[in-house]
């Protein structure tokens, strides 16, 4: 079995303001077992966009249905964009841990660009 | 942490009904199937079933299709199995268990409940 | 359906000893380039814990000394070197389908 990578296939997404970006990301094994992670930027900084363990995400939604036997797309959306969204977003993969997850890894990032909504 | 509570040990009479529960913590309950598994006293792991809490997607072991129920309830982050019809060879040690790769595998396993069935 | 059986239903080995034990399926359980099978270990009193999954990648925290192997319908779990904490019943599972289990094989020290 070849060690899984994290595909996101578009380097740049421009969206109109107040509308919804699609984020692409494919992993191309099950193989480790753990969730995915996206990030708006790099480093300790970074901003935690959505989380399939845990947490709340209103704006997010997922393109596919993650619960789904051999599910390897982990593509978001991300609703109502303003210019506060334009950045770097990176699909993570983790491996199931204990007691936590561990990052295992990332893809190459995809630049989203906000335009302003037409007047 | 992913954690998996299951309510206290049952006694039932043959022909009556149990409600066996299995409350999830640390993680998002509707991204992970739940899987109950039953223990005979000094047998083997029999699978009953599995549930999808985010569309209530089930799917029954054929032995247990006319008998099982399993229910979610994504507000409290709880699932329940009901057996109906109980038999003396019920008595066993009933398990929930979280798919924490939608492997239809069983990563995270609670405690277990023993329900009895005797006259 | 897919029969899981497992061989031995029991054994003893020395301490430090390799350990194996087999499941066979009634049918390959090899679908999408994976073989879905899973080994757990059931120690008394105790929920079963996942051990190998997909047929030979360890789980998080499990001893390297744990190994699962094989294809199609032929599947070994390895324990190079027995520990005391090793003692336990292991069963194997398929989910090509809707899951199954094998019967168990207990596995005790010499």
């Known amino acids: 079995e070849e060690e899984l990578q994290v595909i996101q296939p578009d380097k740049f997404v421009l969206v109109a303001a107040g509308e919804t970006a699609t984020l692409r990301c494919t992993a191309t094994s099950l193989i480790p077992v753990g969730p995915i992670q996206w990030f708006r930027g790099a480093g300790p900084g970074r901003e935690l966009i959505y989380n399939q363990k845990e947490g709340h995400f209103p704006r997010v939604t997922t393109v596919s249905d993650l619960t789904k036997r051999n599910n390897m797309d982990f593509s978001i959306r991300i609703g109502n964009i303003t210019p506060a969204d334009a950045g770097t977003y990176y699909c993570v993969k983790f491996r199931k841990g204990s007691p936590d997850d561990v990052e295992f890894k990332s893809g190459a990032g995809t630049e989203l660009s906000v335009r302003a909504k037409p007047s | 942490q992913v954690q998996l509570v299951q309510s206290g040990a049952e006694v039932k009479k043959p022909g009556a009904s149990v409600k066996v529960s299995c409350k999830a913590s640390?993680?998002?309950?509707?991204?992970?199937?739940i899987n109950w598994v039953r223990q005979a006293p000094g047998q083997g792991l029999e699978w009953i079933a599995m549930?999808?809490?985010?569309?209530?997607?089930?799917h029954y072991n054929q032995i247990f299709k006319d008998r099982a129920t399993l229910t979610t309830d994504t507000s409290t982050s709880t699932a329940y199995m009901e057996l109906r019809s109980l038999r003396s060879d019920d008595t066993a040690v009933y398990y929930c268990?979280?798919?924490?790769?939608?492997?239809?595998?069983?990563?995270?396993w609670g405690r277990g409940t023993l329900v009895t069935v005797s006259s | 359906d897919i029969v899981l059986t497992q061989s031995p239903d029991s054994l003893a080995v020395s301490l430090g000893e390799r350990a194996t034990i087999n499941c066979r399926a009634s049918q390959s359980v090899r679908s999408s380039g994976y073989n879905w099978i899973f080994w757990y270990q059931q120690k008394p009193g105790q929920p079963p814990k996942l051990l190998i999954y997909?047929?030979?990648n360890r789980d998080s925290g499990v001893p390297d000394r744990f190994s699962g192997s094989g294809s199609g319908t032929d599947f070994t779990l390895t324990i190079s070197s027995l520990q005391a904490e090793d003692v336990a019943v292991y069963y194997c599972q398929h989910s090509r389908e809707l899951p199954t289990f094998g019967q168990g094989t207990k596995l005790e020290i010499k």
């Open positions: 268990a979280m798919d924490y790769g939608s492997l239809y595998a069983m990563d995270y």
């Open positions: 640390g993680y998002t309950f509707t991204n992970y199937w």
């Open positions: 997909l047929a030979s």
């Open positions: 549930i999808d809490p985010s569309d209530s997607e089930t």
